[in-house]
């Protein structure tokens, strides 16, 4: 946030940039949390825009029995590995075809025993406040589907009739990692020393990191004709004086008519 300065007072302004603001020759360049001519004001909203998508990674092991292990399969650049990867990917795409969050598989290692396939199942979902539940459900469906296929697609008399066959007992889920996104935590961190006063409110399932000085939210502070200003002790209303009234009170809701205070002296002017 920047505020431009014109005229003779600019040199004075340069030395007076506050809150870590820096002078660029024309104006104070303010850090994210501040704005104003001297970076003296605290912003009332902080952009913590969530990622568009949240990812999860499941580390799985399955044992493929319809391919015999050869040493070339250890080499990821070999033709053997590439052909295995192609078939395995196609097979898994069929297995997980009903899961909207499924993105694909990534083979990390092939080892002996027929072919033990260490791989990651990659999941992704659009960010919503319920993303954890969505991904938790998807990981459960992945477990169900891989268990089912490795039970059903098995060798009979050393022959496989499917694209791939598996050892029923060789299926294991090692680990599940979900990308963590915590808007409340991000909001607190980005608000720094004002963190106690900033909160997350949702609008159209999007999180907004706001202080009570941001209008239009349930926590918004109504300063009436005054101005809401954030300080280290919290949001405060700075009340205004008009030609006819002084305003006071915590929310500037108490107006005193100047003519009542000045009385008849006011009329002699």
């Amino acid at each position: 946030r920047t505020t431009t300065c014109f005229g003779d007072g600019c040199q004075n302004t340069a030395s007076r940039c506050k809150n870590g603001g820096t002078w660029d020759g024309l104006k104070c360049q303010c850090p994210n949390l501040y704005y104003g001519e001297l970076c003296e004001e605290v912003v009332s909203s902080i952009d913590i825009g969530p990622p568009e998508t949240i990812s999860a990674q499941m580390e799985l092991t399955v044992t493929v029995t319809s391919v015999k292990f050869t040493e070339e399969l250890k080499n990821h650049s070999s033709q053997e590995f590439q052909e295995f990867k192609q078939t395995f990917t196609e097979q898994m795409n069929i297995v997980y075809s009903g899961i909207p969050e499924y993105v694909g598989v990534n083979i990390t290692k092939l080892r002996l025993g027929s072919v033990v396939v260490e791989h990651d199942v990659l999941l992704r979902t659009k960010y919503t406040p319920e993303y954890k539940t969505v991904l938790d459900n998807a990981t459960e469906v992945v477990k169900e589907k891989i268990t089912k296929v490795t039970t059903q697609q098995i060798m009979i008399n050393d022959i496989c009739s499917d694209m791939m066959c598996f050892n029923t007992t060789g299926t294991q889920v090692q680990n599940i990692t979900v990308t963590q996104y915590d808007p409340e935590e991000d909001c607190r961190k980005m608000a720094k020393e004002y963190g106690d006063y900033f909160v997350v409110e949702y609008r159209d399932q999007k999180p907004y990191c706001i202080s009570p000085c941001e209008p239009g939210f349930s926590v918004s502070k109504n300063c009436n004709l005054g101005k809401c200003q954030m300080s280290l002790s919290g949001p405060q209303c700075l009340c205004v004086t008009t030609e006819t009234h002084w305003y006071s009170g915590e929310t500037c809701n108490q107006g005193t008519q100047k003519s009542l205070v000045y009385g008849h002296h006011h009329h002699h002017h």
């Epitope: 053997e80 078939t87 022959i159 791939m164």
Partner: nanobody, 123 residues
Framework: EVQLVESGGGVVQPGGSLRLSCAAS????????WGWFRQRPGKEREAVAL???????FYADSVKGRFTISQDNSKNTLYLQMNSLRAEDTAMYYC?????????????????WGQGTQVTVSS
């Protein structure tokens, strides 16, 4: 990239014989798996005879004792000797290959395919 070219198809009377050949380009012939598949009109492609570099072979029940799969590594060629041919053997015959040592009859597991050669058994 493996290139496969079949030959040897034709029209033969029931009880007759044919020998199909599949010439492969590339240096992968001595490893992996090789096979013959066929597709009859209106049917799915099916495994007829398969062979792997570890010596494993497979024959479909309907051709056991009549068909023989073999390969000549020096010529990079796969063969299918077909004897006692029947009308139900009429089909397009395809050569297939994979550098993997496979144990599957499913065509989707096989990566390299020829264009096919037609075999018609008719009197």
């Amino acid at each position: 990239e493996v290139q496969l070219v079949e030959s040897g198809g034709g029209v033969v009377q029931p009880g007759g014989s044919l020998r199909l050949s599949c010439a492969a380009s590339g240096d992968t012939f001595s490893r992996g798996s090789w096979g013959w598949f066929r597709q009859r009109p209106g049917k799915e492609r099916e495994a007829v005879a398969l062979i792997s570099s570890d010596g494993w072979t497979f024959y479909a029940d309907s051709v056991k004792g009549r068909f023989t799969i073999s390969q000549d590594n020096s010529k990079n060629t796969l063969y299918l000797q077909m004897n006692s041919l029947r009308a139900e053997d009429t089909a397009m015959y395809y050569c297939a290959a994979s550098v993997l040592v496979l144990r599957t009859l499913n065509p989707k597991a096989w990566h390299h395919w020829g264009q096919g050669t037609q075999v018609t058994v008719s009197s």
